[in-house]
């Protein structure tokens, strides 16, 4: 990043430094340290104080965004004296040049698209680059396939999500020969950005009095089990008057996904389709293909 780091410190400095790649704040260890603490303050005056590392001369910030600018602060007491130092981390570059309207979504269980728009004051030669770091191994993923608009990167397609974890840090850097470009960063939960496929293997079997609908839970990127799903069934009688209410049935995920409903012979032609959602978010998938049952002369 092309961010200026400005230090505000008394004469005997702790030499505080920040590595944005590892989110690690470190300083020179002092002999006979009795107390140390580090924290950051963001533009909204929110304070984040991480745990100190074992050596007590560094700390790592886990879940922070830096694009609005932050101030790091380190306090150290030794048996002789106290030290205090601030480190300003501004988002340098011309205001309004950073990528904006950034969003990502996971689809088909193992694909992800991220998109953004060029900043309103960005010069014509601006180029953006996306980097993703997972929360666990701090591994960095560089965008493998960019989506372009007139030569400018405005999106990214990933077809290998193995490096992601449940929460990930996204950074869009910018470059230009003319001026400094601000960066944009964001933390995204995979569970909030995944769009499920509809349920698969939908079948309907009827006897003289009932019909049984069965289906399989969709394959997902997230590690989900059966209780994490909520389903909606749309059982629809064909050839009914426009405006007739469809019967929408909510069904909780189960080891065997099934819904049994009364429907006696002779039965009119019906269709059923199913969609799925995460039970906690209810971000519905598209509907499955409609399955027809019953007869026209029912």
């Amino acid at each position: 990043e092309k961010s200026d780091l400005r230090t505000v410190a008394p004469a005997s400095s702790l030499n505080v430094r920040f590595d944005s790649r590892t989110m690690n704040l470190s300083w020179d260890c002092q002999e006979n340290t009795t107390f140390s603490k580090c924290f950051l303050t963001d533009k909204k005056n929110r304070v984040v104080e991480p745990r100190l590392s074992n050596n007590e001369c560094s700390c790592t910030f886990r879940e922070i965004c830096l694009h609005e600018g932050v101030t790091f602060e380190v306090h150290v007491n030794t048996s002789q004296r106290g030290f205090q130092q601030k480190l300003l981390y501004p988002n340098s570059g011309r205001e309004g040049t950073a990528a904006q309207n950034f969003s990502c979504f996971i689809y088909n269980a193992d694909l992800m698209n991220c998109t953004w728009a060029r900043g309103p004051t960005a010069p014509r030669d601006v180029q953006y680059f996306l980097y993703i770091r997972n929360s666990k191994r701090r591994r960095e993923i560089r965008c493998p396939y960019y989506i372009q608009d007139s030569g400018t990167h405005v999106g990214c397609h990933l077809d290998n999500l193995s490096g992601l974890t449940s929460r990930n840090y996204f950074l869009v850097n910018g470059t230009s020969r003319e001026i400094g470009i601000q960066f944009f960063d964001s933390l995204l939960d995979t569970k909030k950005i995944e769009r499920f496929n509809p349920p698969s293997n939908v079948t309907v079997r009827c006897n003289t009095t009932h019909c049984l609908v069965r289906w399989k839970q969709p394959r997902t990127y997230q590690k989900l089990s059966y209780l994490d799903f909520q389903y909606q069934l749309d059982v629809h009688r064909k050839n009914t008057q426009p405006g007739t209410e469809n019967l929408l049935i909510n069904v909780s995920g189960d080891l065997e996904n099934r819904y049994n409903f009364p429907s006696s012979e002779p039965r009119a032609k019906h269709s059923v389709k199913i969609r799925a959602a995460d039970v906690r978010i209810l971000n519905w998938s598209s509907w499955s293909e409609a399955i027809e049952f019953g007869s026209d002369d029912g």
Epitope: K191, K223, S225, Y226, L227, D228, L255, E256, R280
Partner: antibody, heavy 120, light 111 residues
């Protein structure tokens, strides 16, 4: 109807090992995650470990690490728990269970339990 | 000593409402992790009653409800019935212990 059928009660001497089996019927084990929990009158329920899809491996509770092994034979839809170097305080009912949700771990269906008694 | 604290027993007359509390800490319920509740009838295996704080698996009557706030959770049983007499356990994950943890259990007696 999905069921978990566990092996019968065991009586073991201190220092010995015990292997408890858990047979799944009505569903394929390869599509499920099995975890093991034990229950004692003094300590209540203790989670022992099970398959973690995030790590793509079986993870064990710290306090049982080194003494416990969990294995699976998907060809016969059976999961196994082996606990070695048994002590008298390992006397407990051991349950296998199917994970209903991973975040956080929620045990959706339980076996009937296997009583293991450790006594000299 | 269980990581999650529950009252050892509660009781109520048939038709009444009883609640069971489950108190944790900032490393488990307050982390925040979802809470699940299990019912164990005498001499049987536990059965899942509530998951994701307040969701009921299919087959569990709506007389059972639960909620979570801060570092504690509670289970409510309305219209108490004789066959609700059982031990009830709360459970969640504890990040300090890196695994699932349970409450010590609450015996519900129907008077």
């Amino acid at each position: 109807q999905v069921q978990l059928v566990q092996s019968g009660a065991e009586v073991k001497k201190p220092g010995a090992s015990v292997k408890v089996s858990c047979k799944i019927s009505g569903h394929s084990l390869s599509e499920l995650s099995i975890h093991w929990v034990r229950q004692t009158p003094t300590k209540g329920f203790e989670w022992m470990g099970g398959f973690d899809p995030e790590e793509n491996e079986i993870v064990y509770a710290q306090r049982f690490q080194g003494r416990v092994t969990m294995t699976e034979d998907t060809s016969i839809d059976t999961a196994y728990l082996t606990l070695s170097s048994l002590r008298s305080d390992d006397t407990a009912v051991y349950y296998c269970s199917i994970v209903g949700s991973f975040s956080p771990l929620t045990l959706g269906l339980w076996g009937k339990g296997t009583m293991v008694t450790v006594s000299s | 000593q269980a990581v999650l604290t529950q009252p050892s027993s509660v009781s109520g007359a048939p038709g009444q409402r009883v609640t069971i509390s489950c108190t944790g800490s900032g490393s488990n319920i307050g982390a925040p992790y979802d809470v699940s509740w299990y019912q164990q009838l005498p001499g049987t295996a536990p059965k899942l009653l509530i998951y994701h704080n307040n969701k009921r698996p299919s087959g569990v009557p709506d007389r059972f409800s639960a909620s979570k706030s801060g570092t504690s959770a509670s289970l409510a049983i309305t219209g108490l019935q004789a066959d609700d007499e059982a031990d009830y356990y709360c459970a969640t994950v504890d990040e300090a212990l890196s695994g699932s943890v349970f409450g010590g259990g609450t015996k519900v007696t129907v008077l």
